[in-house]
Interface confidence: low
């Protein structure tokens, strides 16, 4: 695990005043902040929002932001007329840049954008844009809300009065009035092409401290179509120092964004500070809990007719403003079994909990590499058919990944099932050893801006030399990345794969739009037929409480991978709970309930929960059923079938579906999901075929951040 050994005090990087005008001076500014002792803060844990007040006294003030805006109590303010925007319709210059501050992603505006009206005391100049988002699948991520309803993303544009101050930073440091606009983003079925430059930029700042210039964009296009309906109140910065100097303009109508585009936000990484160790985490749920209104009055604009237009689509219609939720827990009992030397069968069971029935069908995605070329196919299987699919033309020298997702009404999706990695025909097995690195990582060329660091959050890769050919990786690919295209292949790192018999350098993380981007090819493979292996769900224990991680700075180096957001202790308790919203977003330990029954079974004996499994080397028979005849693969380029591994064309009858993320907006709130039984350790007696290799990647609980999990005390070492 790669540790940053931090020799200076733990200090913040990313509060609202942290971005400065000279791009090339940003490192100097960061050093200056560290030297000046600006307090470290975070969105959870020991440095979370309830602790901000200890180092930033204003955070305990009575006029704090964000707030929930209750429309019925908002007074129409006659002084709040049309906003006057100047420069917003111009394309941004090529000097406009984006930065991952570790707390948000910020756009530093280099052009002149001015706003006046709306009761602002003067003509204000836009300085920067910041974003706040949730954890996955359109979950609530906005800071403000209207009538208790939150949105997947909130964009905030900050302004200062250039007539009074020479810079935004000066206005803040002198505690003088600044302006801020809050714009909600809501999921819709199509990509919003106005956001393309922003989404593209996000892919270039995946890692903390990364900066990138942005393609030209029109700032007006990032605002709601109707600017006439807005709320006004006086509040604060939503991050330390929480200065109560902000005149907020909160727009009523949201801006559309697709799930596909949302994934770019969910793919951003940060570094979290634990004592003197920094670990790489996903930057998610970067919103401050809502604050009390106290004696403040929220006003609403008096722009004529602006509040009459389609009021139902926002204030009265829950469809519009509820954060989109997953429709079920993940499909469970994932199994991949060889049928013969050239065919595999994937099977699964329906989700245990369906929040928004019915399940219409299942999407099965599988990907592989062959001759350094990666491919991926996605196909559907109707829910009333057998929950299994046959993949033919399996190549012995390819690594395969499989995962399944349920599709409900309105194309709403479940969490992803555990992902299974399979490679046939090899006698090499992985002998895991605890990998610990200290110090700053050695940089080596990154393959793309999308490369992600390995991090196990608060867990350590380990297996202490116990040979196994079946590894569970708790990557948080359940609810916390549900609906995403994030791939589990990105957690199969060069270090891990070296032990698995793979050569080659680092694996780039998989961009959220493609699953996968790159997998290593096998270094050597024998020509024996693959034998069935038990599809266990958790080969190793859950993460322990320590903060080990293995980042490679800026995605450089040979170890990249995916992990989940926040650390979590063994018993599943969070270090810190922000508010009720996060409570309701707690995830179950997906996909472990029934599969746990199988863990201590030895192959090849059939187990009660998998009655159709055959002895080693044999074909699997499915009593009373034909083989799957309804699955159609598609590839990422539009469904072209190629000669590579795939479903037998003779078996195919249904229509092709693109393997894209859901881009629809859904009704319904998120019921509190029940906690599922704890994961059991794999006993030493578990045996696996050494001629076939599976690695399962489980949907971990939201805050379980890890790859190959570190065994807790009493677990397998």
């Amino acid at each position: 695990v790669l540790h940053y050994v931090v020799c200076f005090p733990a200090l913040t990087e990313g509060y609202v005043g942290a971005l400065h005008e000279n791009r090339h001076g940003s490192a100097v500014q960061i050093r200056r902040r560290k030297a000046s002792g600006d307090p470290y803060w975070a969105y959870s844990g020991a440095y979370g929002p309830e602790h901000w007040v200890t180092s930033s006294v204003s955070c305990g003030g009575r006029h704090q932001s964000p707030i929930d805006i209750l429309d019925q109590y908002a007074r129409v303010g006659e002084e709040y007329q049309e906003l006057q925007l100047d420069g917003f319709d111009n394309e941004s210059s090529n000097k406009t840049w984006m930065k991952n501050t570790g707390k948000t992603v910020a756009i530093l505006l280099k052009d002149d954008y001015f706003v006046s009206g709306a009761g602002l005391p003067g003509r204000f100049k836009a300085e920067k844009v910041e974003f706040h988002w949730g954890h996955s699948n359109g979950s609530a991520g906005s800071e403000h809300s209207i009538n208790g309803r939150r949105f997947p993303v909130e964009m905030q544009i900050f302004f200062y009065n250039p007539d009074d101050f020479d810079s935004f930073q000066t206005a803040i440091s002198e505690n003088r009035i600044i302006g801020a606009m809050a714009i909600f983003f809501q999921v819709s079925p199509r990509d919003n092409s106005a956001l393309d430059p922003i989404i593209h930029g996000l892919k270039g700042v995946v890692h903390h401290e990364k900066e990138t210039f942005l393609d030209p964009f029109v700032l007006r296009d990032l605002l709601p179509a109707s600017l006439g309906s807005y709320y006004r109140y006086t509040g604060s910065l939503t991050t330390p120092p929480c200065s109560e100097i902000v005149e907020w303009i909160v727009f009523r109508r949201p801006v559309p964004i697709s799930y596909h585009q949302l994934e770019a936000f969910y793919s951003i990484f940060t570094t979290e500070q634990q004592d003197h160790v920094k670990s790489v985490e996903y930057l998610r749920n970067n919103f401050r809990p809502q604050q009390r209104l106290h004696d403040r009055v929220v006003s609403k604009s008096a722009v004529r007719d602006s509040w009459n237009h389609d009021m139902t689509d926002f204030l009265e219609n829950p469809l519009g403003t509820e954060a989109s939720k997953v429709c079920s827990s993940p499909p469970i009992h994932m199994k991949v079994q060889p049928l013969n030397q050239t065919a595999l069968q994937v099977s699964w069971s329906q989700p245990e909990t369906i929040y928004h029935p019915p399940i219409m069908n299942y999407m099965i995605s599988y990907s592989w590499t062959k001759n350094e070329d990666e491919k991926e196919k996605t196909f559907t299987k109707d829910s009333d058919k057998d929950l299994k699919a046959t993949i033919s033309h399996v190549s012995p020298d390819s690594l395969y990944l499989f995962r399944v997702q349920a599709v409900c009404r309105n194309d709403m999706r479940s969490d992803f099932s555990q992902t299974m990695l399979f490679q046939a025909n090899t006698t090499r097995i992985f002998q895991g050893t605890r990998i610990v690195k200290t110090g700053v990582p050695t940089a080596s060329p990154a393959s793309s801006a999308d490369m992600a660091p390995i991090s196990s959050g608060s867990s350590t890769w380990t297996s202490s030399g116990i040979p196994f050919s079946f590894v569970s990786m708790a990557t948080g690919m359940g609810p916390s990345s549900s609906g995403s295209q994030a791939t589990v292949a990105s957690v199969v790192t060069s270090t891990l794969l070296a032990g698995l018999g793979f050569g080659g350098g680092g694996i780039s993380s998989f961009p959220s739009t493609v699953w996968p981007t790159r997998l290593p090819t096998a270094a050597s493979a024998s020509k024996q037929a693959a034998r069935p292996v038990l599809a266990t769900t958790e080969a190793l224990a859950s993460p322990g409480p320590d903060g080990d991680s293995s980042p490679t700075k800026d995605g450089e180096g040979t170890e990249e991978g995916e992990k989940d957001e926040k650390s979590e202790s063994e018993d599943g308790e969070r270090e810190h709970e922000e508010d009720g919203e996060k409570d309701s977003e707690k995830k179950e330990k997906s996909g472990v309930t029934h599969a746990a029954e199988e863990r201590n079974q030895t192959e090849p004996s059939p187990t009660p929960s998998s009655p159709n499994r055959t002895a080693e080397g044999g074909h699997q028979t499915i009593p009373g059923h034909e083989q799957d005849h309804t699955a159609v693969p598609t590839d990422q380029t539009g469904g072209r079938r190629d000669a590579g591994p795939g479903l037998d064309p003779d078996m195919v009858t249904s229509t092709q579906v693109p393997p894209t993320a859901t881009e629809e907006q859904y009704a319904g709130s998120d019921p509190k999901r029940p906690e599922m039984p704890s994961k059991k350790p794999m006993s030493r007696g578990d045996r696996f075929s050494e001629d076939s290799r599976f690695i399962t990647v489980n949907p971990a609980e939201k805050n379980t951040s890890g790859m190959i999990s570190r065994p807790a005390p009493g677990r397998m070492e």
Epitope: V218, R220, S258, N317, R409, N410
Partner: antibody, heavy 116, light 111 residues
Framework: QSLEESGGRLVTPGTPLTLTCTVS????????MGWVRQAPGKGLEWIGI?????STYYATWAKGRFTISKTSTTVDLKITSPTTEDTATYFC?????????????WGPGTLVTVSS | SFVLTQPASVQVNLGQTVSLTCTAD??????ASWYQQKPGQAPVLLIY???SRPSGVPDRFSGSSSGNTATLTISGAQAGDEADYYC?????????????FGGGTQLTVTG
């Protein structure tokens, strides 16, 4: 806020024709605009849309037969090679900026007749 | 291709309630909207997202959806409600997005 289509006329088959939708009261930089047609005595048929950034989407049957473009205040529909089946009233409609699949503002329509 | 099916014509007595249906194989996975079109006029949006009504549309018009059928219900039908009614939905996503209209239902108000 209003829309008005123009350019509809009698054309011979194969002669390209461009219809124009002129908008007032709102900005095309904030809305997607769609074209829908209706043959005499028939139902509505969605042709395609152009979104606020200029990206275009077409019905499967309309790809290659129609081209949608826009300026700051107008949206054009070009019928590349009209056939007699393209005889219809063509409506331009504004798509709700939030709910993509609903058109909340329509023009009165313009009639195109394709005949030899 | 994706097809929305509507009855060609429906009759209702003045003051009565009538339901117009729209079906498709996978409509349960999509949202429907409804439009009213009177002769010689442009369509008017009545319902979007299955059940939501734009401002200005009388509450006599309501939408619902069950299974693969979306329904527009007009309660207390009036002579002015005589028109063609179209359902619509979106099909596909991303670059393959398109909108689809049903064939329309001609509503006749008698009495």
């Amino acid at each position: 806020q209003s829309l008005e289509e123009s350019g509809g006329r009698l054309v011979t088959p194969g002669t390209p024709l461009t219809l124009t939708c002129t908008v007032s009261g709102f900005s095309l930089s904030s809305y997607a605009m769609g074209w829908v047609r209706q043959a005499p005595g028939k139902g509505l048929e969605w042709i395609g849309i152009i979104d606020s950034r200029g990206s275009t989407y077409y019905a499967t049957w309309a790809k290659g037969r129609f081209t949608i473009s826009k300026t700051s205040t107008t949206v054009d529909l070009k019928i590349t090679s009209p056939t007699t089946e393209d005889t219809a009233t063509y409506f331009c409609a504004r798509e709700d900026s939030y709910y993509y699949d609903s058109f909340n503002l329509w023009g009165p329509g313009t009639l195109v007749t394709v005949s030899s | 291709s994706f097809v929305l099916t509507q009855p060609a014509s429906v009759q209702v007595n003045l003051g009565q309630t009538v339901s117009l249906t729209c079906t498709a194989d996978t409509l349960s996975r999509r949202y429907a909207s409804w439009y009213q079109q009177k002769p010689g006029q442009a369509p008017v949006l009545l319902i979007y997202r299955d059940t939501s009504r734009p401002s200005g549309v009388p509450d006599r018009f309501s939408g619902s959806s069950s299974g693969n059928t979306a329904t527009l219900t007009i309660s207390g039908a009036q002579a002015g409600d005589e028109a063609d009614y179209y359902c619509a939905t979106s099909d596909g996503s991303g670059s393959s997005y398109q909108c689809v209209f049903g064939g329309g239902t001609q509503l006749t108000v008698t009495g």
